[in-house]
């Protein structure tokens, strides 16, 4: 992290708390309107690399619900509705931060965790490896 | 959030702290190997809806660096390398959690914030609105 000079108006946190424990206000400030990804757009159906959204739920995690994309096809959908295997549907993945209850079941104690989620799919030209 | 019974081994947090303030250990547990998205795959270049990755930096936020995808074209790239404007490149967006220093410049006090980031692009069939 970036070293930031101590501000006298800040809550105190001693070195003994390393690995660093901080105070986090869970009253979320939302910079955008939160929506179920299925409603936010229909790209998952209109894409040439369409995907399904699967609900991943874990009460020990915050947020407890995460939507995971799974590409419907290995190839990409052409205008005529046929799937073209000269192209590949692949998941676009994003590393996100979540809060994991630690110790488990504790309502007020968390550890930051990075997890990899598939957000949607895109159509790519495959890398073909031929055998000599 | 889901109501979870108080466990006697948990840190204490009184109701006076609402909007709820919790303890978060910033020693991140990584469930996957963290990589620069540019290195993790070359989908951004091989996609029919290619994108560029822009570095968004903010020292008052954790993580301080976020990569934002911007679609290179309005249309989608065909096999011959030309852009097909009968199809559209669109950003796939994901709502993510970040920690915002609050009060500003304080190293140990944060508020959870949701922000919308573009992770990559996908090629979709456009919705055509015909004029009556």
């Amino acid at each position: 992290g970036i070293a930031i000079p101590r501000n006298s108006g800040c809550p105190n946190s001693e070195d003994k708390n390393f690995p660093r424990t901080v105070m986090v206000n869970l009253n979320i400030h939302n910079r955008n309107t939160s929506t179920n990804p299925k409603r936010s757009s229909d790209y998952y159906n209109r894409s040439t690399s369409p995907w399904n959204l699967h609900r991943n739920e874990d009460p020990e995690r915050y947020p407890s619900v995460i939507w995971e994309a799974k590409c419907r096809h290995l190839g990409c959908v052409k205008a005529d509705g046929n799937v073209d295997y000269h192209m590949n549907s692949v998941p676009i993945q994003q590393e996100i931060l979540v809060l994991r209850r630690e110790p488990r079941h504790c309502p007020n104690s968390f550890r930051l965790e990075k997890i990899l989620v598939s957000v949607g799919c895109t159509c790519v030209t495959p890398i073909v490896h031929h055998v000599a | 959030g889901i109501a979870i019974p108080r466990n006697s081994g948990c840190p204490n947090s009184e109701d006076k702290n609402f909007p709820r303030t919790v303890m978060v250990n910033l020693n991140i547990h990584n469930r996957n190997t963290s990589t620069n998205p540019k290195r993790s795959s070359d989908y951004y270049n091989r996609s029919t809806s290619p994108w560029n990755l822009h570095r968004n930096e903010d020292p008052e936020r954790y993580p301080s660096v976020i990569w934002e995808a911007k679609c290179r074209h309005l249309g989608c790239v065909k096999a011959d390398g030309n852009v097909d404007y009968h199809m559209n490149s669109v950003p796939i967006q994901q709502e993510i959690l970040v920690l915002r220093r609050e009060p500003r410049h304080c190293p140990n006090s944060f508020r959870l914030e949701k922000i919308l980031v573009s992770v990559g692009c996908t090629c979709v069939t456009p919705i055509v609105h015909h004029v009556a």
Partner: antibody, heavy 118, light 112 residues
Framework: QVQLKESGPALVAPSQSLSFTCTIS????????VHWVRQPPGKGLEWLVV???????TYNSALKSRLSISKDNSKSQVFLKMNSLQTDDTAMYYC????????????WGQGTSVTVSS | DVVMTQTPLSLPVSLGDQASISCRSS???????????LHWYLQRPGQSPKLLIY???NRFSGVPDRFSGSGSGTDFTLKISRVEAEDLGLYFC?????????FGAGTKLELN
């Protein structure tokens, strides 16, 4: 439990067309794809076509001009039409469920035998 | 099309023996998404094929643990640790990474 059952004529004259029906139970066609595969007597398996849950299709390009696949989700049926049959189309024809968009045929019908002969 | 070459075409065994079947593809079966779509099926005499192993090494539900799959890229192997009578039949490898989906010619597992 998951079941698939093929039906179609047992004997067809050369140059004629042929229609198969695969009737399924224990799963929904709106959630799973269905493949057609054939096996000539004493030989190996040849994949023909798949219709995916969203109605999109993938054909074996060698046979695409002679094949047509469709389905009726509400009736739990998949239909395959094959045109211009020749004697080398004599085979056991199977329909099979796709495991999860990964070309894994996890459940198969018992097959329907077709002989092309004059 | 991707050619799948199985060896041997015939494999005589005694009950309780270990059996090994090889499958080689004419091009890599690693998809752009990182997965390898190589599967194994068993067709017992007079029956339709049954899925044994999917994506190289995953046993399908109900498949005994004496069956195992391994390999990567273009070279794959199915092993049966102790052959039982119900294991006799025709084994096919199949790839789904590239269209059209293709099968190997089959390996007949039979008694000595």
């Amino acid at each position: 439990q998951v079941q698939l059952k093929e039906s179609g004529p047992a004997l067809v004259a050369p140059s004629q067309s042929l229609s198969f029906t695969c009737t399924i139970s224990g799963f929904s066609l709106s959630s799973y794809g269905v493949h057609w595969v054939r096996q000539p007597p004493g030989k190996g398996l040849e994949w023909l076509v798949v219709i995916w849950s969203d109605g999109t299709t993938t054909y074996n390009s060698a046979l695409k001009s002679r094949l047509s696949i469709s389905k009726d989700n509400s009736k739990s049926q998949v239909f395959l039409k094959m045109n211009s049959l020749q004697t080398d189309d004599t085979a056991m024809y199977y329909c099979a469920r796709d495991g999860y968009y990964i070309y894994t045929m996890d459940y198969w019908g018992q097959g329907t035998s077709v002989t092309v002969s004059s | 099309d991707v050619v799948m070459t199985q060896t041997p075409l015939s494999l005589p065994v005694s009950l309780g023996d270990q059996a090994s079947i090889s499958c080689r593809s004419s091009q890599s079966l690693v998809h752009s998404n990182g997965n390898t779509y190589l599967h194994w099926y068993l067709q017992r005499p007079g029956q339709s094929p049954k899925l044994l192993i999917y994506k190289v090494s995953n046993r399908f539900s109900g498949v005994p643990d004496r069956f195992s799959g391994s390999g990567s890229g273009t070279d794959f192997t199915l092993k049966i640790s102790r052959v039982e009578a119900e294991d006799l039949g025709l084994y096919f490898c199949s790839q789904g990474t590239h269209a059209p989906l293709t099968f190997g010619a089959g390996t007949k597992l039979e008694l000595n």
